[in-house]
């Protein structure tokens, strides 16, 4: 049993025992492993119900995965003196169902935050901004990983989950410096239209494995730094002209569209024309039609306008019952 202050080269990570001594600025909390050399603390799969209070001041990378935290209150990481070095915080798979406003306040160097695999029934609009001001102090966050944070249906609030997440992303315009945002596997049916406008620095956006049917009301126009846009494994049927033009206008972007149920009818003509000339779409020759049945498995790039027909809609007077 020893604290991080008595670290030895033969044991870079030291598990601590509960101690009667007062907390020291560089001691290792109970049920955690610490490496001062690596500036890392790991409290992993220990069924912790709250964030340890006695985290060492040197901590730069903090892993709190696989616990039972349930609620992350305001100031969950606020310490005196503050954890000024903490840059990467991983809380994935810790059974969080509530993240309150100001949960990540007083972490001036926090660049990467991973809340994945927590069933967040409640995510405060001020979880990342820390205040309810219309314009808050900029968050230091550069990478925000929110994969599979959708709660089970019976735990959802009345408001839409998409709306709740969007509110947290845009509050106070705090995340203007965000470069990476992962929102995969969240059952999103739509993307609230204002979200991307508030995240102008995004370089990597992962919306894969959701249930997005359309991007008609989503604007990518101001994401001029975007390099990767992941839309695989959604329910996209077609991309319309407005979306195509916006994507084409982004100077560095690569778009991933695999495993969507493309509907190859007359509405697909513009997208097919665009696919044939764009360099934006990765693996574009692997995009295939899912509907109608007669077109299933056809490669989009190999379609021509004659292939893309729509059944005529008869006027009511000509329809038979």
């Amino acid at each position: 049993t020893s604290s991080a202050s008595s670290s030895s080269s033969s044991a870079p990570f030291l598990a601590s025992a509960a101690s009667a001594q007062p907390p020291l600025p560089d001691q290792c909390p109970a049920l955690c492993e610490c490496s001062e050399a690596a500036r890392t603390v790991k409290c992993v799969n220990r069924n912790l119900t709250e964030v340890p209070t006695d985290l060492p001041l040197y901590v730069r990378n903090l892993f709190l995965t696989g616990n039972q935290l349930a609620v992350l209150p305001a100031g969950a990481f606020a310490r005196r003196p503050p954890l000024a070095e903490l840059a990467a915080l991983n809380l994935s798979g810790s059974r969080l169902d509530e993240v309150r406003g100001g949960a990540f306040e007083h972490l001036p160097s926090l660049r990467q935050l991973d809340l994945s695999h927590n069933p967040l029934a409640y995510l405060s609009p001020f979880a990342f901004s820390g205040s309810n001001a219309s314009i808050s102090a900029p968050s230091p966050l550069v990478e925000l990983i929110l994969n599979h944070i959708v709660p089970p249906d019976d735990k959802r609030q009345n408001r839409s989950f998409e709306g709740m997440v969007a509110a947290a992303l845009v509050a106070g315009r705090a995340l203007q410096g965000l470069h990476l945002l992962e929102l995969a596997s969240n059952h999103f049916l739509y993307l609230p239209r204002d979200v991307l406008a508030q995240l102008p620095s995004l370089r990597y956006l992962d919306l894969s494995n959701n249930s997005l049917v359309s991007l008609t009301y989503v604007s990518f126009r101001n994401l001029t730094h975007l390099e990767s846009l992941h839309l695989e494994d959604n329910a996209l049927k077609v991309l319309h002209n407005g979306t195509l033009a916006e994507l084409q206008g982004l100077p560095h972007v690569r778009v991933f569209l695999d495993n969507n149920p493309w509907v190859c009818d007359c509405h697909m003509a513009d997208m097919v024309t665009w696919l044939k000339q764009t360099g934006v779409v990765q693996g574009k020759d692997r995009l295939t039609c899912a509907f109608p049945e007669k077109m299933r498995n056809r490669v989009l790039l190999e379609l021509n306008s004659a292939d893309l027909d729509c059944d005529p809609i008869l006027p009511p007077s000509l329809q038979t019952s």
Epitope: N259, D285, R286, N297, R298, V299
Partner: antibody, heavy 116, light 107 residues
């Protein structure tokens, strides 16, 4: 109707190469991927890779890179798979299938026997 | 690579029985799963695509279900011509991978 007709059985010596063929009829040949699948005696199915005939685009299972090479002849609606440096492990039935999100039509299979 | 596992390698049932064949993936595959039938003469046919869609010409006694990592094929009323080996296959990520197969025999 869609049909995939594969070449007949082959008996080859170790170290040799062989080229199996798969002729497609009944659909727009360039509009669909063609898949190749291996089945060793008493074993299951193993995906080798795929080719998009109109473009020559290919994807290979890492395990078969350097072993299998796909080509296509759009004038005869035929896809070929060449297997090189044959060993007894290559003895199997090889199927071609029309692909994409699923393999909806299959050839009858070509049996390759490698023996000294 | 995604591993596909069919835990039952052979299955014996009587004509008219309801038979269920299961298949599990080593990671979530988003319902991107197909089922194939291979007859004793080597002929292979697609039965079910995208977990539950019946391929044209396939009898309605065949059905598929599942999500995430666990999937199944059900034959509701076993007929003599259903004697075959059944394979699941994922197409969520390259390389495509097949299960080891379940051989169905008549009691």
């Amino acid at each position: 109707q869609v049909q995939l007709q594969q070449s007949g059985g082959e008996l080859m010596k170790p170290g040799a190469s062989v080229k199996l063929s798969c002729k497609a009829t009944g659909y727009k040949f360039t509009g669909y991927w063609i898949e190749w699948v291996k089945q060793r005696p008493g074993h299951g199915l193993e995906w080798i890779g795929e080719i998009l005939p109109g473009r020559g685009s290919t994807n290979y299972n890492e395990k078969f890179k350097g072993k299998a090479t796909f080509t296509a002849d759009t004038s005869s609606n035929t896809v070929y798979m060449q297997l090189s440096s044959l060993t007894t492990e290559d003895s199997a039935i090889y199927y071609c299938a029309r692909g994409g999100r699923d393999f909806d039509f299959w050839g009858q299979g070509s049996t390759l026997t490698v023996s000294s | 690579d995604i591993q596909m596992t069919q835990t039952t390698s052979s299955l014996s049932a009587s004509l008219g029985d309801r038979v269920t064949i299961s298949c599990s993936a080593s990671q979530g595959i988003n319902s991107n799963l197909n089922w194939y039938q291979q007859k004793p003469d080597g002929t292979v046919k697609l039965l079910i695509y995208y977990t539950s869609s019946l391929h044209s010409g396939v009898p309605s006694r065949f059905s598929g279900s599942g999500s995430g990592t666990d999937y199944s094929l059900t034959i509701s009323n076993l007929e003599p011509e259903d004697i075959a080996t059944y394979y699941c296959q994922q197409y969520n990520k390259l390389p495509y991978t097949f299960g080891g197969g379940t051989k169905l025999e008549i009691k």
